[in-house]
């Protein structure tokens, strides 16, 4: 028996470890919160819906509620959609948290309230206001969180949610809050520290704020404090995307020197854009466990020269010094300080943004004995001359990153060619720094209204391509030719990431000859030449190569395109080769005896396959090991018949999704004794098959979403026993039979997706309304998008909802 | 020129309490730390404690209780207050200047001429 | 707290010499070591910062060297007015400290 009706429009998850019961109603346009929720309800999630109010009855009978997620039901105005304006705040009403003893977390970000609202549980450890309209703080309204350790008050008076006032915050407000861990007054125009604190606290956010200068004591108490975020006070301004008033003068937010003196368990400290110009080592007197420091866009690259603070962060992992350019200079080359060599625990050095024209070894000999030392970021750095062999001096990086720089072909700075003595200004390369949101965005940890959480930490580099190993980070850079001797030493490299140059050379198998190690190779983004099946070849560990989007010379006619590259590639599991526009190929077949996942989108097999044309039907056909083949956005609007037949012997998983088929040939299936997966989403098919199982005895996930289909063939899932997942939705079905839909193969299915049709609810429906209402299958958006198109009184009525009982009277009579 | 000039009681009786003043020109006292020193009859150099240029002070753990540094920025003037004075106290009091910016560690580039102070009864 | 041991405790030495001094600390200090010249009945003068570097006005008869633990400092050709007291303080951090002294007289 189901314990909770199918008409709740929400998805309801058991988490047994935690002994949880969830239930996500987000994004389901509701106006009230739904009955039928589930009285052993712990986790409730209301968020982006337009439900008006709260009240005592809300949460009646929902006595076990530990979370409730009731975000985004009414954003302020500047923030929220324009289309959807929420113009009435959400009203609270007296008591309508007040019984919910187990009561832990509360969200209310995003619903414009004035107030911190009242008549609390005392059990609540969490309370998120982000997102509102509060901007006074007093200490009477904090009165019932005895007991709150996590506070978030942040965006509430800000560039995107005005307040037009001061933001106030009464003397002392937080110190009776003496469980308080996490408090966050991000975005706020706040303008000084609010003082006295709880000592209790862990992480304080301030960032984003108009706090020109920090009070010797403010910060006096604060022993426990592991994450002291201060950024966006007096900030750097050059190139903001968002409105950014920097201090008077263009001053840096002042610190006392001892400021952090009782800071002795700082893990983190952030201090991104605070125009500063100088990082006095006396303030790291007593933070000997600083582990991760961010001086990102500030005034700093004379300091990174001297740096003398660095020998006071024994412990420091992480440090970030990017975007810290002098207006209009560019430097010859990079000047870190010696004092960089005794970051022994240093993992990850971000120096993004420095501007410099030439990378010399000696500039990073600083760095050669950190031995802990992972990441290095010199990532848009506008260089153009680097002599990449430098990096055999860090084989045990894992990442280096040179991405976005203006490097070239390996030529020294002698050569004329690649390189200019003008100071060239740096307003220049706007639109790129720009490009780059991580360090140029206003919030980088805002929540969105669909999650709750803080948006992941930046990772520059392409993840798939990274746990191969050591990386070498190439892409946007000004390559148009590569050799042998620019990789030499550099033997040790397991990925390498040329994506986004000019490289438009015939490669011949000599080019990365030293890259013995070589795994992973992104050569994405460029105007590959493929004249030489010889190509690649020297890559001999190669396992994944990315070629996508290398149109540049396939879009040209007459040209030699040796497509059997892949032969001389004797461990390649991957290749990449979408958006190439590839529309010939001197040579008819693919040839690999490793190859196993292979991505063909956005490519012309329309041409290739061109009716009358039987030369290019084997062309994956010996790829002898492939288990998936992509070959969707290929204009096939049509299939000729020997395509089938030309497929390789033990594909699994077959996508010909945003084709334009209008037509499929369901019994060439049985050519593919072992698929899978068939993705025929995003086509023109009207048709299913008139018995799946006669194409296919091996199918389990059938894909047919966003199609024509307007009704199922009367047999279409007899005996199609292996069927696990089948998407019908976002197509024209009208009606499902009951021999369309036989039991004892739908109760296999662990997923069916129906939403987004146009079913007849007539009495011909009452058998599909019956399963629907007792199947245990599931079926997502069940009961808000399985919907009725007609008749008139049934029109836009879910059908999990419909009562046939007429039409069952009828059928007995 | 960078000048920096103390002045003192000269004689303090046992268990009173010890006030310097340093009274500095050619430089803001915003701008630089300054440190007290001291150097007993025929003995080496000890540091007392500094006041930076944004008002910050740091001391000497063995003396902290005893000692307290502050300044006039608009008179140019650091004092020095010392509490519960002993004859091991009887030195030549220096004041000095930090050489660098606020903050950062470095040597000491100026010193007055120091003044003696006499603990006896 | 840091402990700066200088050695030795006098020296005597003729004019035109070459004298020595050296200076340890207890811990790594890198480079933050000064080195002050203190003459009979004034107040020291400061010869050498960041271990190596000559403080304006100083005469380039006298160098400092040295990084981490181990520090020096060095006169060549020793002239009548060198004599006197010499001082080694490190300023990597507070509190700062200085060593005992050298006290290096004339032969």
């Known amino acids: 028996a189901r314990w909770f009706p199918k008409t709740l429009p929400c998805d309801v998850t058991l988490d047994v470890p935690k002994n949880h019961v969830i239930v996500d109603c987000t994004d389901k346009h509701l106006t009230e919160i739904p009955g039928g929720i589930p009285t052993n309800t712990t986790n409730l999630t209301l968020t982006i819906n337009h439900i008006p109010d709260i009240s005592p009855a809300s949460f009646h009978r929902l006595d076990h509620l530990v979370e409730i997620d009731f975000r985004c039901n009414c954003v302020p105005i500047p923030l929220g959609s324009k289309n959807n304006m929420c113009i009435k705040r959400l009203q609270i009403k007296p008591r309508s948290f007040s019984g919910l003893t187990y009561l832990k977390s509360l969200y209310l970000d995003g619903n414009q309230l004035l107030e911190i609202p009242q008549g609390l549980p005392p059990s609540l450890q969490l309370l998120s206001l982000e997102a509102n309209n509060i901007f006074s703080i007093r200490k009477e309204n904090l009165t019932e969180l005895a007991n709150i350790e996590i506070l978030y008050l942040g965006q509430n008076c800000y560039y995107r949610n005005p307040c037009y006032v001061s933001y106030s915050i009464e003397k002392d407000a937080f110190l009776n809050l003496t469980k308080l861990k996490v408090l966050s007054l991000k975005d706020n125009n706040v303008t000084a520290v609010p003082t006295v604190l709880p000592s209790t606290l862990t992480e304080l956010y301030l960032y984003n704020n108009m706090i020109a200068k920090i009070q010797e004591d403010d910060f006096n108490n604060l022993n426990q404090l592991q994450i002291l975020d201060l950024s966006g006070n007096c900030p750097r301004c050059y190139n903001a995307p968002f409105p950014c008033a920097p201090c008077k003068n263009n001053s840096p937010l002042q610190i006392p020197v001892n400021a952090f003196d009782a800071l002795t368990e700082l893990k983190v400290l952030r201090l991104h854009s605070n125009s500063l110009q100088h990082v006095p080592p006396r303030w790291f007197k007593n933070i000997n466990k600083l582990q991760e420091l961010d001086l990102s866009q500030n005034f700093l690259a004379k300091e990174i020269g001297d740096a003398k603070f660095l020998h006071f962060l024994p412990s420091l992992i992480q440090l970030d010094l990017s975007f810290n350019f002098e207006l209009q200079v560019y430097r010859a080359s990079m000047n870190l300080s010696q004092a960089f060599s005794s970051l022994k625990s240093l993992k990850i050095l971000r120096i993004r943004g420095y501007v410099f024209k030439e990378l010399k070894s000696f500039n990073l000999s600083p760095l050669h004995n950190l031995q802990n030392l992972e990441v290095l970021d010199l990532g848009t750095n506008f260089i153009k001359i680097a002599n990449l062999s430098m990096f055999k001096q860090f084989k045990r990086l894992k990442v280096i990153d040179l991405s976005v720089n203006k490097i070239s072909p390996s030529g020294d700075s002698s050569e004329v060619g690649f390189c200019s003595n003008a100071r060239t200004s740096v307003e220049s390369y706007e639109p790129q720094v720009l490009e780059q949101l991580h360090y140029f965005r206003y919030d980088k940890y805002a929540r969105s209204c669909r999650f709750k959480n803080k948006e992941a930490s930046f990772m520059s580099v392409n993840e798939s391509c990274y746990k191969y190993g050591q990386t070498l980070d190439l892409s946007k850079n000004s390559i148009f030719f590569v050799k042998s001797s620019d990789f030499q030493h550099l033997s040790f490299l397991k990925c390498l990431n040329l994506s986004g140059n000019l490289i438009s050379q015939t490669l011949n198998g000599s080019e990365f000859q030293p890259l013995a190690e070589l795994r992973y190779l992104d050569f994405s983004n460029n105007r590959l030449d493929l004249l030489h099946s010889t190509a690649f070849e020297e890559l001999h560990k190669l396992e994944v190569l990315d070629i996508s989007s290398n149109s540049h010379y396939f879009q040209s006619e007459g040209i030699t395109h040796m497509l059997n590259f892949t032969k001389n590639l004797k461990v390649l599991q991957k290749l990449m080769m979408n958006d190439n526009d590839i529309s010939s190929s001197t040579s008819r077949t693919m040839e690999s005896e490793s190859l196993r996942t292979l991505e063909f989108r956005g490519n012309h097999l329309d041409v290739l396959w061109r009716e009358g044309d039987n030369r290019y039907l084997q062309l994956f056909k010996n790829l002898l090991k492939l288990e998936e083949l992509d070959i969707s956005k290929n204009s096939l609007s049509f299939l000729p018949s020997g395509v089938f037949d030309g497929m390789p012997p033990n594909l699994k998983n077959l996508s010909l999704a945003k084709n334009g088929l209008k037509s499929f040939s369901w019994k060439k299936l049985q050519c593919l004794k072992n698929l899978e997966t068939l993705d025929l989403s995003h086509n023109q098919l009207t048709t299913v098959p008139e018995r799946l199982s006669n194409c296919s005895r091996s199918l389990k996930n059938l894909i047919l979403k966003n199609n024509q289909i307007r009704s199922l063939t009367k047999y279409f899932l007899q005996d199609a026993f292996q069927l696990r997942y089948l998407d019908l939705s976002s197509n024209k079905i009208q009606m499902i039979q009951k021999t369309s839909f036989p039991e004892n193969v739908l109760n296999n299915l662990k997923m069916l997706l129906l939403h987004h049709n146009r079913f007849l609810c007539t009495c011909d429906a009452v058998w599909f309304v019956w399963w629907v209402n007792h199947t245990e299958v599931t079926i997502p958006y069940l009961a808000t998008d399985v919907t009725c198109v007609g008749p008139g009184a049934h029109k836009g009525q879910s059908v999990i909802s419909l009562d046939l009982y007429t039409c069952e009277l009828d059928l007995t009579n | 020129q960078v000048q920096l000039k103390e002045s003192g009681p000269g004689l303090v009786a046992p268990s009173q309490s010890l006030s310097i003043t340093c009274t500095v020109s050619?430089?803001?006292?915003?701008?630089?730390?300054v440190n007290w020193v001291r150097q007993p009859p025929g003995k080496g150099l000890e540091w007392l404690g500094m006041?930076?240029?944004?008002?910050?002070?740091d001391y000497n753990s063995a003396l902290k209780s005893r000692l307290s540094i502050r300044k006039d920025n608009s008179k140019s003037q650091v004092f020095l207050k010392m509490n519960s004075l002993q004859t091991d106290d009887t030195a030549r009091y220096y004041c000095?200047?930090?050489?660098?910016?606020?903050?950062?560690?470095?040597?000491?580039?100026?010193w007055g001429q120091g003044t003696s102070v006499t603990v006896s009864s | 707290d840091i402990q700066m041991t200088q050695s030795p405790a006098s020296l005597s030495a003729s004019v035109g010499e070459t004298v020595t001094i050296t200076c340890r600390a207890s811990?790594?200090?890198?480079?933050?070591l000064a080195w002050y010249q203190q003459k009979q009945g004034k107040s020291p003068q400061l010869l050498v910062y960041?271990?190596?570097t000559l403080a304006e006005g100083v005469p380039s008869r006298f160098s400092g060297s040295g990084s981490g633990t181990q520090f020096s400092l060095k006169i060549n050709s020793l002239q009548p007015e060198d004599f006197g007291s010499y001082y080694c303080?490190?300023?990597?951090?507070?509190?700062?400290?200085f060593g005992g002294g050298t006290k290096l007289e004339i032969k």
């Open positions: 960041d271990a190596k």
């Open positions: 000095a200047r930090d050489k660098g910016y606020d903050g950062y560690y470095y040597a000491m580039d100026y």
């Open positions: 303080q490190h300023h990597y951090g507070i509190p700062y400290t």
């Open positions: 811990e790594n200090i890198y480079s933050y």
């Open positions: 050619g430089f803001s006292l915003t701008g630089y730390g």
């Open positions: 006041i930076w240029g944004d008002g910050s002070t």
